[in-house]
């Protein structure tokens, strides 16, 4: 806290300009009005005050607006949004798309901090949806923002904000939002051609089901090892070995370093051992030539 | 401000259906947030039974889904539940509400005893 | 389904005391987690939302922490007006579910 001390002849400010980078804290305490500087916040960002005289600015604010500052101020605090606690955040009531994106660039580059974190739930929230111009807006900032939404947010992401995507955005997705995902990105993309098409899925196909992954397999797309093991278990293990050498091309010996691991190890132990060893990779733990091969699920989906 | 206000019967038959009303003031439905029906029973264990969305989509608990059914009237601002052949376990004080991210409006709720 | 599992089911503590709740779920919800409070014969109110967010109203004493499937909600120096039965609830995915309740009561 800094003392109340009278303002020293000549020294009140009649203006937010740069001569107050000259001020020492008690100075700008007793000479600065709370309310000139909230009608002026836009010029702060452009005035190289020091940590120190920031706090003191900010204290002032917190005096002026004890229930939280209006939005006017909010959309100019530039860099004073850096000295902002989640407390003080939470008290704020941001409503206008323009206002996050200017305190979202303030803080471009960085890991999303906690204040930003709790500014942007308090806007969605605030709003009671996650629309396309959000969404994007967030996505540009925080592009890994799409795998932080729960699977009922993503339900509503409308299928045009999915073309944005780039892979790494994904990369922390787990498999109930890709499965959420996987269909949005099926429609986004559905008149592109086949190369291209396979480019852009790709990432998403951890949500895709069976019968997809049939479907890109009779279209030579080569789909890597690391995209093949991220695929959702269940919808692997119904696809033959002819699908899968057809699905991974070349990429096909990659299997043998990954037979212990799943989905490879799950998809092997469903599969006849003379089908794996047309591979020629040696992969072991197949289905032994003779046995009688029962499907229990359309046993059970029969009964 | 918004308020949400249950309406229906206190009673209800077993093997009937119970229709329960929810009336939002101060922000129209179509606007943003989903509207939840929750309910409270006798000892009270809260169950989240549906919600509708703001854009008309709804989803329901997996253990009702067969005899629940929630839809909106957006002319009048309200959303509805109906709950078909009810049993004694389904005596409860029902709750509308809205959320996101967590309920942070709710009605008072209303009190329904299933007894012949 | 995720379960939700609150601990302890009941509690005494006296005023100005800290205490604190638990909840584990069954599986990860991120941070789509609620805390909520409800007086005898009223409706649920929200404390904390996104596992940590206190709701607009709710004073700073309260204190929601936690992520992934293990939560917590700490009430610091507890008023009067604190005691009731608190709830967590998740939002991750439907069908949302509640955790059984921990009533909190004066010494």
């Known amino acids: 806290e800094v003392e109340k001390t009278a303002c020293p002849s000549g020294k009140k400010a009649r203006e937010i300009d740069e001569s107050l980078i000259f001020y020492k804290k008690w100075e700008l305490e007793a000479c600065v009005d709370a309310a000139l500087l909230a009608t002026q916040m836009d010029r702060v960002n452009a005035i190289p005050f020091t940590y120190e005289q920031l706090d003191v600015l900010k204290h002032k604010l917190d005096e002026l607006y004890p229930q939280g500052y209006p939005e006017s101020v909010i959309q100019h605090l530039g860099y004073l949004f850096l000295k902002m606690s989640p407390e003080d955040i939470r008290k704020w009531n941001v409503t206008s798309l323009e206002t996050l994106k200017a305190l979202l660039e303030v803080n471009k580059g960085h890991e999303m901090s906690p204040q930003v974190a709790t500014l942007i739930d308090r806007f969605v929230k605030g709003r009671g949806q996650l629309d396309k111009d959000t969404l994007d807006t967030l996505t540009a900032f925080y592009p890994g923002y799409l795998c932080s939404l729960s699977p009922e947010e993503l339900s509503s992401v409308p299928p045009s904000s999915i073309w944005a995507v780039r892979p790494q955005d994904l990369d922390t997705c787990d498999p109930r939002q890709l499965d959420v995902l996987y269909p949005k990105a099926r429609l986004a993309f559905q008149n592109m051609n086949g190369s291209e098409y396979f480019v852009k899925i790709q990432s998403f196909l951890g949500g895709a089901p069976t019968e997809d992954l049939k479907a890109l397999s009779q279209q030579n797309v080569s789909m890597d090892l690391a995209t093949f093991m991220k695929l959702r278990t269940d919808a692997v293990l119904p696809l033959t070995v002819a699908e899968v050498q057809k699905l991974l091309g070349p990429h096909v010996e990659g299997l043998k370093a990954e037979e212990r691991h799943r989905p490879v190890r799950d998809w092997i132990l469903r599969q006849r051992q003379d089908d794996l060893d047309t591979l020629g990779l040696g992969l072991q733990g197949g289905i032994p030539n003779g046995y009688l091969v029962l499907d229990l699920s359309m046993q059970e989906a029969l009964s | 401000d918004v308020q949400l206000q249950e309406s229906g019967p206190g009673l209800v038959k077993p093997s009937q259906s119970l229709s329960l009303t929810c009336s939002v003031t101060g922000y129209s439905i179509t606007s943003g947030y989903y509207w939840n029906w929750i309910r409270q029973f006798p000892g009270n264990k809260l169950e989240w039974m549906a919600y509708i969305r703001y854009d008309g989509s709804n989803n329901y608990n997996p253990s009702l889904k067969n005899r629940i059914s929630i839809i909106r009237d957006t002319s009048k601002n309200q959303f509805f539940l109906r709950l078909n052949s009810v049993t004694t376990e389904d005596t409860a004080t029902y709750y509308c509400a809205k959320s996101y991210y967590g309920m942070d409006d709710w009605g008072q709720g209303i009190s329904v005893t299933v007894s012949s | 389904d995720i379960q939700m599992t609150q601990s302890p089911a009941s509690l005494s503590a006296s005023v100005g005391e800290t205490v604190t709740i638990t909840c584990r779920t069954s599986?990860?919800?991120?941070?789509?987690l609620a805390w909520y409070q409800q007086k005898q014969g009223k409706s649920p109110q929200l404390l904390v939302y996104?596992?940590?967010t206190l709701e607009n109203g709710v004073p700073s004493r309260f204190t929601g922490s936690g992520s992934g499937t293990q939560f917590s909600l700490k009430i610091d120096s507890l008023q009067p007006e604190d005691f009731g039965t608190y709830y967590c609830?998740?939002?991750?995915?439907?069908?949302?579910?509640f955790g059984g309740g921990t009533k909190l009561e004066i010494k």
């Open positions: 609830q998740h939002f991750w995915t439907t069908p949302y579910t």
């Open positions: 599986g990860d919800i991120h941070n789509y």
């Open positions: 996104k596992a940590k």
